[in-house]
């Protein structure tokens, strides 16, 4: 988890002087509770936006937006803590909006936004906005949270982001798998425009079962430049096991931008359809 760039982050708006600060996610008001605390955020919205860095890279970011409730507690609102928790790693990153002037009610509802948390493809986050100071131990909670899942690199809009392109999202191998005679598979795929090696991982399964009955790995050396974007054809020999008929072929590239952590593509060959046993035709037709 990180913030997009380190350019000046702005939270000021007409009628409010505000600064964005790094936060330890442990606001002082936890340790030194205040008697009067503000109410919780209203209408918290989390959206996926895309933002360019100063270097021109494109990253997915969490766009966080919320409004204030129209009650008197606005007079005691000193700021907000924005927290993003990545659920699979338990990593948390926080920033603090510090209000340098007192808020006053005005003709329209106060609205705040922040779009600088960089999020990763196919990751789930819990986004929390906490109004500050935080409540006393038995006080009503004054935060709002939402869980938010970022699409993976297969998604059309994600595919062109820098983290996805770095993991090989623009490569479409267009895999075809053909069953040959004598227990063989012919695998064909399109090479990318990089002189790097590939690995074909074959896993076979019995019909309707998920534990493998055969595994095989095939190494493909790095292509020469004249072979870029050409089809590569490989014939794999299967183990002659009756019923070991469903084959999953996975192609793992080793591009320089992602090494052994590149996006893999796969194709599956189903077991052949069992022909229905035909009804025996009777020798004679009964008359009744």
């Amino acid at each position: 988890l990180r913030l997009l760039d380190h350019r000046a982050l702005v939270c000021s708006q007409p009628g409010l002087n505000c600064t964005v600060k790094n936060s330890t996610c442990l606001d002082d008001s936890w340790i030194h509770p205040r008697n009067l605390t503000p109410s919780s955020p209203k209408d918290l919205q989390i959206q996926l936006h895309f933002a360019h860095t100063q270097q021109g890279d494109l990253f997915p970011v969490a766009h966080i937006e919320w409004t204030l409730q129209t009650d008197a507690s606005i007079l005691y609102l000193e700021g907000a803590e924005l927290s993003v928790l990545q659920l699979n790693t338990n990593e948390r990153l926080c920033v603090r909006f510090e209000f340098l002037s007192k808020l006053r009610h005005h003709h329209r509802r106060w609205r705040f936004t922040f779009s600088h948390f960089v999020v990763d493809p196919d990751q789930e986050y819990e986004v929390t906005v906490h109004h500050l100071p935080k409540p006393i131990p038995d006080g009503d909670p004054n935060h709002q949270s939402k869980n938010f899942l970022v699409p993976d690199c297969e998604h059309a809009r994600m595919k062109v982001t820098t983290p996805c392109m770095s993991s090989g999202s623009l490569w479409d191998p267009n895999i075809t798998v053909e069953t040959l005679e004598a227990h063989q598979l012919r695998v064909s795929f399109t090479l990318w425009n990089e002189s790097t090696h590939y690995q074909i991982l074959l896993t076979s399964f019995p019909h309707m079962e998920n534990h493998s009955c055969f595994e095989h790995m095939h190494h493909i050396p790095a292509p020469r430049p004249e072979e870029f974007h050409q089809r590569s054809n490989v014939t794999l020999t299967l183990r002659n096991l009756k019923g070991c008929c469903r084959h999953q072929v996975q192609i793992q590239p080793f591009f320089s931008s992602c090494l052994n952590d590149c996006l893999r593509h796969s194709a599956t060959v189903s077991c052949p359809e069992m022909p229905d046993t035909p009804e025996p035709i009777p020798d004679y037709m009964p008359l009744w």
């Epitope: 209408d43 919205q45 989390i46 959206q47 996926l48 936006h49 969490a62 766009h63 789930e124 709002q144 949270s145 939402k146 869980n147 938010f148 899942l149 970022v150 699409p151 993976d152 297969e154 998604h155 059309a156 809009r157 994600m158």
Partner: nanobody, 127 residues
Framework: QVQLVESGGGLVQPGRSLRLSCAAS????????MHWVRQAPGKGLEWVSG????????DYVDTVKGRFTISRDNAKNSLYLQMNSLRAEDTALYYC????????????????????WGQGTMVTVSS
């Protein structure tokens, strides 16, 4: 124009099944997470189920888990809700809704982030 149209509602006996459909048009359906939300007579909106853009993640409110199944067919721009073992308390107007953003908001606090709603289809469970 951008719209969602639900169908498949009706009167059904307890324990029976219904399949709701939602036809989407006017936007890139396969980019967005989709949801089902219901409103029982005289009650507020209740989020029922959600599905990510590629069906990779699905979620349900606890009261329908194991009975309802959400699915989608991106080639047909369609969202579905298979409802089995229906109960009287499932009686409601069922809406399909599109997520405003490309991400997928998970759980019951998400309804305020939906920007397109259908007109709803009524499901009545009664003997």
């Amino acid at each position: 124009q951008v719209q969602l149209v639900e169908s498949g509602g009706g009167l059904v006996q307890p324990g029976r099944s219904l399949r709701l459909s939602c036809a989407a048009s006017g936007f890139s359906f396969d980019d967005y997470a989709m949801h089902w939300v219901r409103q029982a007579p005289g009650k507020g909106l209740e989020w029922v189920s959600g599905i990510s853009w590629n069906s990779g993640r699905v979620d349900y409110v606890d009261t329908v888990k194991g009975r309802f199944t959400i699915s989608r067919d991106n080639a047909k721009n369609s969202l579905y809700l298979q409802m089995n073992s229906l109960r009287a308390e499932d009686t409601a107007l069922y809406y399909c809704a599109k997520e405003r953003s490309l991400g997928y908001c998970r759980g019951g606090s998400c309804s305020d982030g939906f920007d397109i709603w259908g007109q709803g289809t009524m499901v009545t469970v009664s003997s």
